[in-house]
């Protein structure tokens, strides 16, 4: 029987330009009688184009909603209404092409067509994209708050704030031809729920979204995108009302970077540049396309290539690369944003050299792509370490913590945390290696004790790269580097001359200097410790929620010991600069780690000093007495300590916590406490030092209060940011 | 000092309960785990099971579960340790032992021991 | 439960001897292993816990070493008082278990 042909609306965007027009401030108001007459004449006259082709039968509707520079471009969607069987063959490039080729044929004619009588339109500057209702619809929400700006070579654009009455606003940014708008978003509240979201094309169209921001990011203060031409929206949606604009847009035009280079390594290890998308940190724009070619000096060498927060990964099937596409060797591999480092290892096979193509493969970009490139030795890609084949990166191996997440670097130990003894493979303690006694069979862990010897896990890194073999030598009052550099920066870690956490006492003026209590509004919130003259360690979750993100709020004491009332010895300072781990991670507590910088260098006193920071190497062995201290409740649910609380506690071996706590514990983590409970920080003490005395007298930071199953529970451990799996970070923010 | 001294020893029916009582000295049983361990003659040592004796919290091993009761008296600082449906096999000197308060258990101090004897 | 097996179950030595009791544990206890000496009649005694650590009072002669699942107590210069029953025990997770004991005689 008759069956009824199944029609589907087909929605497209397209800008054409009209040669013989100019484009004028008129033509930016929608309220101005310039722009209603203008939209009247392109209307009909694109209307009158498309019905001019095949395509006419299909016609449905259609709108002229902008205009801009160029001499003057109009920027249109219409609908064709066609039936279901022909919606592939009428894709925007056919649609494209069938419009140019209408035009082009009249360019020269000296009938009179409909569509000409007004405008003299260029085939050249047609443009047809696929969009959608819904695109149509998000547009036309925003019709009511349009704000369409050009941007001239060399200008940077500061755009008004939008309209507060608006629910939703567009701004429509065109640049100079040939060149790309950068347009730069700086949140300037603390909290907000506005959102936006910047687009490749002149409207709101979802498959040409380039990225979108919600509620006053933290991650990320600032911003910066890149479209792939002269053309941009951005649409902002309100959020909770406000009368300050919670960020500030600019725009500018800039050139196209070429994003190609040829690089001789040299013939050395470790890293020996940076390969970076264009205008880094920017995200990348939706066309960039990187072909970088390195040539390695000889084959015993693999290049590296070192990614932070980015990991590479094999895509299954054929589907596209969301966060951009890589060619290395032939092999295509898909980018991914983690919170953690990655490093993609390149065997050499020929002299040739290695290409390496970067390209995003949709509109969708994300933050700019950096990469650390250098070489490694192929036969011995981590002396002293363990290659961990899930990342690339070299860790440490049998230390007691897996490091690699599949846990090979704590399989097949002879000795996991222990010294072994070169005669028998005895496993020593480590503190008994170069203690002046012999403690294996035949001494080896007293042998090269006065001179360097390969790095390895619990070898001591000198400033001069060199290794020495005695495990944690740092301020002990006797140096063991060449360069003296075990015992430089030592002014750490001693306690005052001076004589509750849970089961805890009360500490004594001048017991832990470094003990920083952090305010907001003159009450305790967290714990910290002073590592340096102008810097706090604290827990990144202290600023976990959005209204404790700003500076402004806190106050940093220190030398304090009662909450209630202040003594000569105690200061106070603001904070000029908060930052956070950048791989932190809320629901993880992975990276649980945030610096203050004080607003003023602190003066040292009996009661002000910084504790010493451990080197990577340095082993706080399981069952070590530690002590936390901090003004934490003193019991599950109850008020903040009045007087700072001191306890000690026990370290626990890495892979009993994370049984406990069924594998939640990560190698950036460290666990302590009693199995009586009694005994363990809690609400309060988060962020507050975890610290641990050395041989030497000295008390070096082990570990900050970060998370734990409720307070001094039996069976349940508290557990710890571990500082020796942050210090890198550490020491890049502070030095 | 710390001390923990134990009752004398005690002969059975088999079937029947045996209590043994251990009485600490020299520091606050709230602040410790106590256990009991037990030695068969020539036999190794057995963990049967702890008490908390600040919450009377107990742990025992799974090989006594049902058989052994722990409890503590904070007041005299003793704790006691009685097994039923008493068996040959549970012929033993019977250890109470201090265990350490850190989450790791062994144990520091013990006391005198108390042979128990199971006999028809 | 962790097993933990204890070589040999007695050995004979002398006086100044250098004298090495192994314990194997059934699974890694990282570095969880204590050590105990026991004469006859007596109760048992710590020695040696965390594998390494000495208990307050005990001579430098006792040493602890090992790592994973495979662990040592030596006695560098054996005294007469030495002779005795030693002990080993994991406390890494409950049930806390001990070796099958390794008797020191004298030869």
């Known amino acids: 029987g008759y069956k009824a042909e199944v029609m589907v609306s087909q929605v497209y965007s397209g800008s054409l330009r009209v040669l013989n027009r100019h484009f004028s401030q008129d033509l930016t108001r929608r309220e101005s009688s310039a722009f209603r007459s203008e939209t009247a004449k392109a209307q009909k006259m694109l209307k009158e184009l498309i019905t001019s082709t095949r395509l006419g039968t299909y016609y449905n509707s259609s709108s002229v909603y902008s205009f801009g520079e160029g001499p003057l471009t109009c920027f249109f969607w219409f609908i064709l209404q066609i039936p279901e069987h022909r919606r592939l063959m009428l894709s925007p490039e056919v649609v494209q092409a069938l419009l140019v080729e209408e035009l082009l044929s009249t360019v020269n004619s000296s009938a009179a067509v409909p569509y000409r009588a007004e405008y003299e339109v260029d085939p050249e500057g047609l443009v047809i994209l696929e969009a959608s209702v819904k695109d149509i619809a998000a547009l036309n929400s925003t019709l009511g708050c349009y704000r369409y700006s050009y941007v001239g070579q060399g200008q940077v654009l500061r755009l008004k704030g939008p309209d507060h009455l608006a629910s939703s606003c567009l701004w429509h940014l065109q640049g100079p031809k040939d060149l790309m708008l950068k347009l730069r978003l700086e949140w300037t509240l603390a909290e907000c729920r506005d959102r936006l979201a910047m687009y490749d094309v002149a409207g709101p169209l979802e498959k040409r979204l380039i990225t979108s921001v919600y509620g006053c990011s933290r991650q990320e203060p600032v911003v910066e995108v890149l479209a792939s031409g002269a053309i941009m929206a951005v649409v902002w949606k309100k959020g909770l009302h406000s009368y300050y604009d919670p960020f500030v847009l600019s725009v500018q035009p800039v050139v196209f970077q070429a994003c190609e280079v040829n690089l001789t390594l040299d013939n050395r290890l470790d890293s020996q540049g940076v390969l970076s998308t264009p205008y880094f940190p920017s995200y990348y724009s939706p066309q960039t396309h990187c072909s970088w070619h390195l040539t390695v000096p000889s084959l015993d060498y693999g290049l590296a290539l070192w990614f932070d927060a980015y990991a590479l990964r094999r895509q299954k099937y054929d589907l596209p690369c969301t966060q951009g596409q890589w060619t290395i060797q032939n092999r295509r591999l898909c980018g991914l944003r983690i919170l953690q480092p990655y490093a993609e290892r390149i065997p050499v096979v020929a002299t040739a050299g290695i290409t390496i193509n970067f390209t995003s493969q949709i509109s969708l970009t994300g933050p700019g792509v950096r990469v650390h490139y250098g070489l490694y030795n192929q036969s011995d890609p981590c002396p002293g370490e363990f290659l961990c084949s899930v990342n690339g990166l070299c860790v440490p191996a049998c230390d007691g913590v897996k490091d690699c997440p599949n846990g090979l670097d704590e399989r097949n130990c002879v000795c996991r945390a222990t010294f072994q003894c070169k005669e028998d493979s005895t496993c020593i303690s480590l503190p008994k290696v170069c203690d002046g006694q012999p403690d294996c069979l035949n001494g080896s862990d007293e042998e090269q004790c006065q001179e360097g010897v390969p790095c390895g896990t619990f070898t001591f890194q000198c400033e001069d790269r060199s290794c020495v073999k005695k495990p944690n030598p740092q301020c002990d009052g006797r140096p063991d580097c060449r360069d003296g550099s075990d015992e430089e920066h030592c002014d750490c870690g001693l306690q005052g001359p001076s004589s509750r956490i849970v089961g805890g006492a009360v500490s004594s003026e001048g017991e832990w200097p470094w003990q920083a209590s952090l305010q907001v509004r003159g009450r305790h919130i967290c714990g910290g410790a002073l590592i340096a003259d102008r810097w706090v360690i604290t827990a990144a979750h202290c600023f976990q929620e959005d209204s404790m993100a700003s500076t402004v709020l806190w106050t940093v004491f220190l030398g304090k010991v009662w909450q209630n009332s202040r003594w000569p010895g105690e200061v106070s300072f603001k904070v000029s600069r908060l930052l956070l781990h950048p791989y932190h991670e809320e629901d993880s507590h992975d990276y649980d780690v945030a610096l203050l910088q004080l607003d003023h260098p602190v003066v040292r006193s009996a009661a002000v000093r910084p504790v010493c920071l451990p080197a990577r190497s340095h082993f706080f062995e399981p069952g070590l007495h530690c002590w936390i201290t901090g003004w934490g409740a003193l019991r599950e649910g109850g008020p903040i300590s009045n007087a700072l609380q001191k306890v000690d506690v026990q370290l626990i071996p890495q892979d009993l916590c994370s049984e406990v706590y069924r594998y939640q514990v990560t190698p950036r983590m460290l666990c302590a406490g009693y199995r009586k409970g009694k005994k363990d920080a809690c609400q309060g003490d988060s962020g507050g030092p975890l610290v641990c005395k050395a041989l030497s007298g000295r008390w070096f930071l082990a570990g900050l209060v970060s998370w734990g199953l409720g307070c001094g529970r039996p069976n349940y451990f508290g557990v710890y940011t571990r500082i020796t799996g942050v210090i890198s970070w550490i020491q890049q923010v502070v030095t | 000092e710390v001390q923990l001294v134990q009752s004398g020893a005690e002969v059975k029916k088999p079937g029947a309960s045996v209590k043994v009582s251990c009485k600490a000295s020299?520091?606050?049983?709230?602040?410790?785990?106590i256990h009991w361990v037990r030695q068969a003659t020539g036999q190794g040592l057995e963990w049967m099971g702890r008490?908390?004796?600040?919450?009377?919290?107990?742990e025992y091993a799974p090989k006594f579960q049902g058989r052994v009761t722990i409890t503590a008296d904070t007041s005299t600082d003793t704790a006691y340790m009685e097994l039923s449906s008493l068996r040959s096999e549970d012929t033993a000197v019977y250890y109470c032992?201090?265990?350490?308060?850190?989450?790791?258990?062994?144990?520091?101090?013990w006391g005198q021991g108390t042979l128990v004897t199971v006999s028809s | 439960d962790i097993q933990m097996t204890q070589s040999p179950s007695s050995l004979s030595a002398s006086v100044g001897d250098r004298v090495t009791i192994t314990c194997k544990a059934s699974?890694?206890?990282?570095?969880?292993v204590a050590w105990y000496q026991q004469k006859p009649g007596k109760a048992p005694k710590l020695l040696i816990y965390?594998?390494?650590t000495r208990h307050t009072g005990v001579p430098s002669r006792f040493s602890g070493s090992g790592s994973g699942t495979d662990y040592a107590l030596t006695i560098s210069s054996l005294q007469p008082e030495d002779f005795a029953t030693y002990y080993c025990?994991?406390?890494?997770?409950?049930?806390?278990?001990f070796g099958g004991g390794t008797k020191v005689e004298i030869k």
């Open positions: 699974q890694d206890v990282s570095t969880a």
């Open positions: 025990q994991q406390h890494y997770r409950s049930p806390w278990t």
């Open positions: 965390w594998a390494f």
């Open positions: 008490i908390d004796p600040e919450d009377a919290e107990s």
């Open positions: 032992t201090r265990g350490d308060s850190m989450m790791v258990t062994y144990f520091d101090y």
């Open positions: 020299g520091f606050n049983i709230k602040d410790y785990y």
